[in-house]
Amino acid sequence: EPPTACREKQYLINSQCCSLCQPGQKLVSDCTEFTETECLPCSESEFLDTWNRETRCHQHKYCDPNLGLRVQQKGTSETDTICTCEEGLHCMSESCESCVPHRSCLPGFGVKQIATGVSDTICEPCPVGFFSNVSSAFEKCRPWTSCETKDLVVQQAGTNKTDVVCGPQDRQRALVVIPICLGILFVILLLVLVFIKKVAKKPNDKAPHPKQEPQEINFLDDLPGSNPAAPVQETLHGCQPVTQEDGKESRISVQERQ
């Protein structure tokens, strides 16, 4: 009886079990009662990767540079060409028929796995203690700056997108703040003293006065070491010194009382 099933690496045709062609060869003619299966090697640009009864070999895959592809492994008569993507690109699918640019990890995310020719960038959220403030296809999450190692203290906490801001410690801050405060206090004290002196010098409103001509009051008369005849610097509101013009005395006219 003719066979209904054949052994491995055989196929059934015309009630015959014929040998399949080995990888790298195509079928030219089926076996007969008197002949073997006839096979021929695939040509240079073709392949067959299995035991087969194909009458035509498959064309090697073309790695199209216009689609960002390049040859990773040249095909043989038994294997297909393997394409991969140019630098900065990865395959769109497993068959790698075209390429797309690698994805960048946004701020707050770092690169977990750098992209290859066949896989995209894998991003991960920056955990506590790490940050990323850039959009990048290469950079991992960076650890927050350690203020302690710099003998500084955290002035502003870090986030997944920003680093911590470090500042000087309390002792150092005191060395800066105390002199500033003392300076401010000294200026205030000076102003208070000037004000008190001015108030104390005012004439008594209750005493009768003869009618007087308008007279000039010299505020500097009472200041120790003042010379009313010498020109002095005046200061504008903006704290910039202004030189007194020559030939003018530093006196302020007081209006005659009504």
Epitope: V28, S29, T32, E33, T35
Partner: antibody, heavy 112, light 112 residues
């Protein structure tokens, strides 16, 4: 159904050429198989003479040296035997065969 | 060339008996793929040979299961389990593993 039908002269003079035709029906001779010529001498001894393959290639029995030629006409689905310089020793019944199917045989006598 | 030695030359049997014919080759008929192209033919009186068995043990279409083939390498046997009158004729073995193809000398099956 595959059928092989032979034709050709039954009498050939010594030193002349023997020519036989085999017409095939039911199967194309360009598809597969060896298309053989076999002869049977008086006393039943069988001798394989040669074949033309489906692809047109040939194989001959070295005992026939350079006297044999097997050709074909694919348009008519026929193949041919030509045996040159025949002698009385070539007197036999000639068969064309695919081996699973045989022609009816042609009895050829070489005689002057 | 490969010599095919067939025995016996003549085999007288009674109808219903089993008959066995032997064929030996001068070298192995197994090819590099492990296939052995050894065939058995029956030639009935006045007819062309007809294929019975191909590749040692495969019955050709339409051949009754009374006919079976066995063997490997260089030793082969054709067995007819229950001989009937229609089985009478000359049996030939033929190897087509190596060129030139060669036939056995034939075994004549006759009634006792």
């Amino acid at each position: 159904e595959v059928k092989l039908e032979q034709s050709g002269p039954g009498l050939v003079k010594p030193s002349q050429s023997l020519s036989l035709t085999c017409s095939v029906t039911g199967y194309s001779i360009t598809t597969n198989y060896y298309w053989n010529w076999i002869r049977q001498f008086p006393g039943n001894k069988l001798e394989w003479m040669g074949y033309i393959n489906y692809d047109g290639s040939n194989n001959y029995n070295p005992s026939l040296k350079n006297r044999i030629s097997i050709t074909r006409d694919t348009s008519k689905n026929q193949f041919f035997l030509k045996l040159n310089s025949v002698t009385t020793e070539d007197t036999a019944t000639y068969y064309c065969a695919r081996l699973d199917y045989w022609g009816q045989g042609t009895s050829v006598t070489v005689s002057s | 060339d490969i010599v095919m030695t067939q025995s016996p030359l003549s085999l007288p049997v009674s109808l219903g008996d089993q008959a066995s014919i032997s064929c030996r080759s001068s070298q192995s008929l197994e090819n590099s793929n492990g296939n052995t192209f050894l065939n058995w033919f029956l030639q009935k009186p006045g007819q062309s040979p007809q294929l019975l068995i191909y590749k040692v043990s495969n019955r050709f279409s339409g051949v009754l299961d009374r006919f079976s083939g066995t063997g490997s390498g260089t030793d082969f046997t054709l067995t007819i389990s229950r001989v009937e009158a229609e089985d009478l004729g000359v049996y030939f073995c033929l190897q087509v593993t190596h060129v030139p193809f060669t036939f056995g000398s034939g075994t004549k099956l006759e009634i006792k």
